[in-house]
């Protein structure tokens, strides 16, 4: 099919365009080009007869068109009016006509744009600035660049007027940047020169440096003032309210105690009309001052607060030293020193961090020590302890219970019996108790500073007669040659005799057996498998004698070195090999076999039928006790003869 391709499709003014013909039919008589989408004699540009190779201009010919034998049309020196459709009319030798239409667009070459601004010196946090990209051009796209980056997303940035205008609302000093605009159309793109936005701001609150406020007599005082400001601030110094000089730096040589006072720096911005001042109090010491410690938290709470201890005063070119408990600082991740060593920070204080803390200032002759400071760390209450620990009392005695919970400030105590409040004291005293005084005794400890409370409940039984005792153990499955086991006979009672039996016999004499806690606790050190026996405790008082149920100690041991049976190591070819492995172990071990180092099966018995000399080699039994975490093995050589 006959088609027209425009090369290029978008044409810049003054350039040329080629209307290239594709699929031109053969056996042509001639062809004509027309301006527009149809054949119109009034709008004929040029005609061409192939036989004569004669080109004939039409009414729409401008003199800038050239027709080629292949029917393509070149138009030079393109003008805006050339935009539009072009129709090729082909007359074939059989006088049958064929038409095709093509088109192109003409765009002007864009000029270099420029930026105009409605405010050349906007004031921070007050003014808005509108940048406009000039000139205004039809069919052009406008783009903006800030510091050669595309525009950031910000509610303070707004594009309008077809993106030709960029408005910055409530300018800030951070808007001081290079702004460029760019115009684009299909045939060109031009970028403006950059415009630097000059935002007026400040002055901010001035900073006086150095920060130290303590000086020795005879030193030079050299204070510098700086305030962020545009244009740069003008500075004035005042001492004790009296104007000194309009400079950024204040220098006073060889100061004396009389130079102590308040030093004010005033920063002024003539464009914004704003003033800001900062005051520092300078102290001049006749002698090196005795240091002292200030704390940012006088009553820190344990495990919650950090405390920063600062050694005062701040003196230039001084070495600061610290001591805790009259020792140099221990290495601890919870202790941090500032770069100048003047501030010691305790992270997440504990009750052990009370101190005392001392700091020192080192001078040429000596080290001046501060007075010690003790931290008042608030903690607790911990779980209260009720003493004595007896749970059984005989009727007629006096019951005197004392409660204590570690706490700072000291805890306030309350006693409850069977949930009923009794008294707000640390000690509870009941004289001449009876069985009616049996019950649940609760001590409640309260820390008024932290607001925390903790309680401990103790069951008190008043009975002349003791109950059947029971044995508690601190280790239900001890490991042989490793663990110790402590058996305790419960309950704990006053005026009670505790006795022990092993397998129905009184305790054997052994350095590994130890009685403690009034014979109430029996400890077995370094248990062995032979300690796996029945342990019974007995209690006796004035009216009763009772035995506990036996507790059998389950000692974990092994695996011992395994034994492979039968012991034979020589076999005849064709026999069955049936090896059994056994190792003393509690609990029973896991078994596995290896032949010549190659893993076989996880069974206690290894069976191979009709062995041959190929079965010669080393047979290893491996045993493993998961409870003790121990392993063992044995290797046996097997020879099979033909």
């Amino acid at each position: 099919k006959l088609t027209i391709e425009s090369t290029p499709f978008n044409v810049a003014e003054g350039k040329e365009v080629l209307l290239l013909v594709h699929n031109l039919p053969q056996h042509l008589f001639g062809y004509s080009w027309y301006k527009g989408e149809r054949v119109d004699g009034n709008r004929q540009i040029i005609g061409y007869v192939i036989g004569t190779q004669q080109a004939t201009p039409g009414p729409a010919y401008s003199g800038r068109e050239i027709i080629y034998p292949n029917a393509s049309l070149l138009i030079q020196n393109i003008i805006q009016n050339d935009t539009g459709f072009y129709t090729l009319h082909v007359i074939k030798s059989d006088l049958v006509n064929e038409e095709a239409t093509g088109q192109f667009r003409v765009y002007p070459e864009l000029p270099k744009p420029s930026i105009s601004s409605n405010n050349s010196k906007p004031v921070e946090d007050k003014d808005a600035v509108a940048f406009t990209c000039e000139p205004e051009t039809q069919d052009a796209t406008y783009l903006w660049w800030v510091n050669n980056q595309s525009l950031p997303v910000s509610p303070r940035l707004q594009l309008s007027n077809g993106n030709r205008t960029l408005t910055l609302f409530n300018v800030t000093r951070n808007d001081t940047a290079s702004y460029k605009c760019e115009t684009q159309n299909p045939v060109s793109a031009r970028r403006s020169d950059s415009v630097i936005l000059n935002v007026l701001y400040g002055p901010d609150a001035p900073t006086i440096s150095p920060l130290n406020t303590s000086y020795r007599s005879g030193e030079n005082l050299n204070l510098s003032c700086h305030a962020a400001s545009n244009p740069p601030a003008q500075y004035s110094w005042f001492v004790n309210g009296t104007f000194q000089q309009s400079t950024q730096e204040l220098f006073i040589p060889n100061i004396t105690v009389n130079n102590s006072g308040s030093y004010t720096c005033q920063a002024h911005n003539s464009d914004t009309g704003l003033n800001r001042t900062t005051v520092t109090t300078i102290t001049v010491y006749a002698e090196p001052p005795k240091p002292f410690i200030t704390s940012n938290n006088s009553n820190p709470v344990e495990d919650e607060d950090a405390v920063a201890l600062t050694c005062e005063p701040e003196i230039q070119n001084t070495t600061y030293l610290w001591w805790v408990n009259n020792q140099s600082l221990p290495v601890s991740p919870r202790l941090q020193l500032s770069n100048d060593n003047r501030t010691l920070t305790l992270l997440s204080v504990t009750r052990n961090d009370v101190g005392p803390y001392e700091c020192g200032i080192q001078n040429e002759l000596s080290v001046d020590h501060s007075d010690p400071v003790i931290l008042n760390v608030l903690y607790g209450p911990d779980d209260p302890t009720i003493s004595p620990s007896y749970t059984y009392y005989r009727p007629g005695v006096n019951l005197s219970l004392s409660c204590h919970a570690a706490s700072n400030p000291p805890a306030q105590y309350s006693w409850l019996i069977d949930g009923n409040i009794q008294q707000h004291t640390q000690e509870l005293f009941i004289s001449n108790i009876t069985e009616k005084n049996s019950g649940l005794y609760t001590c409640q400890a309260n820390n008024s500073a932290s607001g925390h409370s903790r309680t401990t409940v103790k069951t008190i039984t008043v009975s002349a007669e003791l109950p059947k005792p029971s044995i508690s153990s601190n280790n239900s499955k001890p490991v042989e040659d490793k663990d110790a086991v402590a058996f305790t006979c419960e309950p704990e009672a006053q005026n009670t005799t505790y006795l022990w039996w092993v397998n129905g016999q009184s305790l054997p004499v052994s350095p590994r057996l130890q009685l403690s806690n009034g014979n109430r606790t029996l400890t077995l050190f370094n248990v062995t498998r032979n300690d796996a026996r029945a342990y019974v405790c007995g209690i006796q008082n004035s009216v009763s004698a009772n035995r506990s149920d036996p507790v059998t100690l389950d000692v974990l041991y092994g695996p011992d070195t395994p034994i492979i049976s039968p012991p034979d190591s020589s076999y005849l070819s064709g026999a069955n090999l049936n090896l059994s492995c056994h190792s003393a172990s509690n609990p029973s071990p896991q078994y596995s076999w290896r032949i010549n180092g190659i893993p076989q099966q996880h069974t206690q018995v290894l069976f191979i039928a009709k062995i041959t000399p190929n079965n010669n080699g080393t047979y290893a039994c491996f045993v493993s006790n998961l409870a003790t975490g121990r392993n063992n093995s044995i290797v046996k050589s097997i020879t099979v003869s033909a």
Partner: antibody, heavy 120, light 106 residues
């Protein structure tokens, strides 16, 4: 072998006092509590008191406070019951007994009893 | 004081017969203990801590109960069992005995 040997029968006048003894063998009285029990003729048993010979601690039934006094002498392994201001109501057999562990078993050992007769 | 009431006060039983003696306490006690006494002899601890037989006591004897109600049972009466049986509480002072149950052979 554990034994409690009590002193012989007593015939005493009304208003007088008497001191009964109980001597232990086969164990140390310091290691155990000694109880005393009264049994009137054709009557039941009444608990009087116990003593801890190691420290002299005692516990009396209210009825016998002022009437009975318990003491012990560790050197002779003997416990004593002193009865004062005797009346016909005090005519009875008085037993000492002890609850001890003999080996693995808790055993209750009794003396043979001492008969006290109060005459007017 | 905790009062112990034994019943019956006196009873007779034929050989082989089952015998039950009860002891009721005026307040709850931890355990009950039983003593056997034959004429002219000292009492013997027979059952301790409610249900444990003292050394040498035949297995036909048993004890049970809790709180305020306890009992001594002989599964099959024998001639040597004829005696007076006393219950005793040791939970609170003063320690008290029941008045006794006299068991005779029928």
């Amino acid at each position: 072998e554990v034994q409690l040997q009590q002193s012989g029968a007593e015939l005493v006048r009304s208003g007088a006092s008497v001191k009964l003894s109980c001597t232990a063998s086969g164990f140390n009285i310091k290691d155990n509590y000694m109880h005393w029990v009264k049994q009137r003729p054709e009557q039941g048993l009444e608990w009087i008191a116990w003593i801890d010979p190691e420290n002299g601690d005692t516990e009396y039934a209210p009825k016998f406070r002022g009437k009975a006094t318990l003491t012990a002498d560790s050197s002779s392994n003997t416990a004593y019951l002193h009865l004062s201001s005797l009346t016909s109501e005090d005519t009875a057999v008085y037993y000492c007994h002890v609850l001890i562990y003999a080996g693995y078993l808790a055993m209750d050992y009794w003396g043979q009893g001492t008969s006290v007769a109060v005459s007017s | 004081d905790i009062e112990l009431t034994q019943s019956p006060a006196i009873m007779s039983a034929s050989p082989g017969e089952k015998v039950t003696i009860t002891c009721s306490a005026s307040s709850s006690v931890t355990y009950m203990h039983w003593f056997q006494q034959k004429p002219g002899t000292s009492p013997k601890l027979w059952i301790y801590s409610t249900s444990n037989l003292a050394s040498g006591v035949p297995a036909r004897f048993s004890g049970s109960g809790s709180g305020t109600s306890y009992s001594l049972t002989i599964s099959r009466m024998e001639a040597e069992d004829a005696a007076t049986y006393y219950c005793q509480q040791r939970s609170t002072y003063p320690l008290t005995f029941g008045a006794g149950t006299k068991l005779e052979l029928k």
